[in-house]
């Protein structure tokens, strides 16, 4: 195989378009990301260039290994689209577009509890709301560190609600909720709310 490729050979599949990818597609503002531009042809010395729209961001030479471009996504317009150009001598091919999804992280949610007390049961309604963060937000409710609800998806800035009925317990119960959106590995928790045991008239959240 020729080390130097002429443009005639570009008409064949000897020099296909490069591939542009990133391990993270969903990012938050201020996040550092790495973009990888690679080519199937491992024997050629290739010059890789990265573009966001028509703005040239950088150039690297490589042979057999992907070119790595490190960026910081600080503004909405930096979400893309990005393209990578692979060039050998005067011949070039561009990758498909790659765009990031910029997501604002969720802030710590607030858990509110409302209880209706009967002689035998407590009817508990849990409300959880994160006032900031890109929608949709998935909320999960916990009792004593164990999930007691499925993930509840909210596409509006309204609290997630979960109802449960419990026999009047003899022990304290601790509740909290988790808020999570599309940002990977990024979840926040409410402050725990402790529900006291039923000894005496101690039900601060109860509707009398």
């Amino acid at each position: 195989r020729k080390a130097v490729l002429d443009c005639e050979a570009m008409k064949t599949n000897e020099f296909p378009s490069p591939c542009l990818d990133s391990k993270t597609k969903v990012v938050m503002k201020g996040q550092n990301v790495s973009m990888f531009c690679s080519h199937k042809n491992k024997s050629l010395q290739i010059t890789y260039s990265l573009f966001r729209r028509k703005t040239h961001l950088g150039t690297q030479d490589g042979k057999g290994e992907p070119a790595i471009f490190n960026l910081s996504i600080t503004e909405a317009h930096e979400s893309g689209p990005y393209k990578c150009k692979a060039q050998v001598t005067s011949c070039s091919k561009y990758s498909r577009d790659f765009s990031f999804t910029i997501v604002d992280p969720v802030t710590s949610p607030v858990l509110n509890i409302m209880v209706i007390q009967t002689e035998t049961d407590r009817h508990i309604t849990l409300h959880c709301l994160s006032v900031n963060g890109s929608l949709p937000i998935n909320y999960t409710f916990f009792e004593n560190h164990v999930a007691i609800s499925p993930a509840i998806s909210k596409y509006d800035r309204e609290p997630a609600e979960f109802n449960l009925t419990k026999k009047n317990p003899g022990e304290e119960e601790e509740y909290r909720c988790e808020a999570k959106n599309r940002l990977p590995n990024y979840a926040t928790y409410s402050h725990p709310v402790t529900m006291p045991s039923t000894g005496g008239d101690s039900c601060p959240f109860c509707l009398k």
């Epitope: 729209r53 150009k85 005067s90 070039s92």
Partner: antibody
């Protein structure tokens, strides 16, 4: 109807300045395009001058020969782009076209053109 | 600079004729196919006919076709119609340290 309308052309003396306007109707600049200027001297080739991106940052792209004397700007609230031309010479005499293209790196072709405005540089 | 050379600079033909115009760039255009063709009638703005060397722009009749890659490109009108008498331009694009959008100087198609 989607259209581009250029204005501001006319007779100017060598060394003088002129600002051309391109008003876009039926186009929402917030949809993000490159708004460009291309000129055509009488009986000569078309010649690309430069472009401005209508998105928030407004990246500019110029032909290397145009840098310095020619400045492109925009007013998104008026859906208008401008071409400021300084230190004009006789060879700048041409019909100046406003043209639109997509904002992606592969949107290099001009898919909408205005009717052009004539600039004559002469003493 | 990238130079786009069109040939012929003018040609005369009759309605129904097959017309071929060539465009040669001084170096390979970007992506091997970033070349567009435009039609311009006197006193009018250019109109996009073909982009990516061979893709027909919206609303362009199928008698127009484009081919080529790298440095050599062709515009073909399979059966010339009265409304096709005009000047045709090619435009090639590539990036070095700046963007280049270079036009050929045109091929004028007139009635024989």
């Amino acid at each position: 109807e989607v259209q581009l309308v250029e204005s501001g052309g006319g007779l100017v003396q060598p060394g003088g300045s002129l600002r051309l306007s391109c008003a876009a109707s039926g186009i929402d600049f917030s949809s993000y395009y490159d708004m460009c200027w291309v000129r055509q001297a009488p009986g000569k080739c078309l010649e690309w001058i430069g472009c401005i991106y209508t998105g928030s940052v407004g990246e500019l792209y110029y032909a290397s020969w145009a840098k310095g004397r020619f400045t492109i700007s925009r007013d998104n609230s008026k859906n208008t782009v401008y071409l400021q031309m300084n230190s004009l010479r006789a060879e700048d005499t041409a019909v100046y076209y406003c043209a639109r293209r997509g904002s992606g790196v592969d949107d290099y072709y001009f898919n909408l053109w205005g009717q052009g405005t004539l600039v004559t540089v002469s003493s | 600079d990238i130079q786009m050379t069109q040939s012929p600079s003018s040609l005369s033909a009759s309605v129904g004729d097959r017309v071929t115009i060539t465009c040669q760039s001084s170096q390979s255009v970007d992506n091997n196919n970033w070349l567009a063709w435009y039609q311009q009638k006197p006193g009018k703005a250019p109109k996009l006919l073909i982009y990516d060397a061979s893709t027909l722009a919206s609303g362009v009749p199928s008698r127009f076709s484009g081919s080529g890659s790298g440095t050599d490109f062709t515009l073909t009108i399979s059966s010339l119609q009265p409304e096709d008498f005009a000047t045709y331009y090619c435009q090639g694009t590539y990036y070095t340290t700046d963007w280049w959008n270079s036009f050929g100087c045109g091929t004028k198609v007139t009635v024989l």
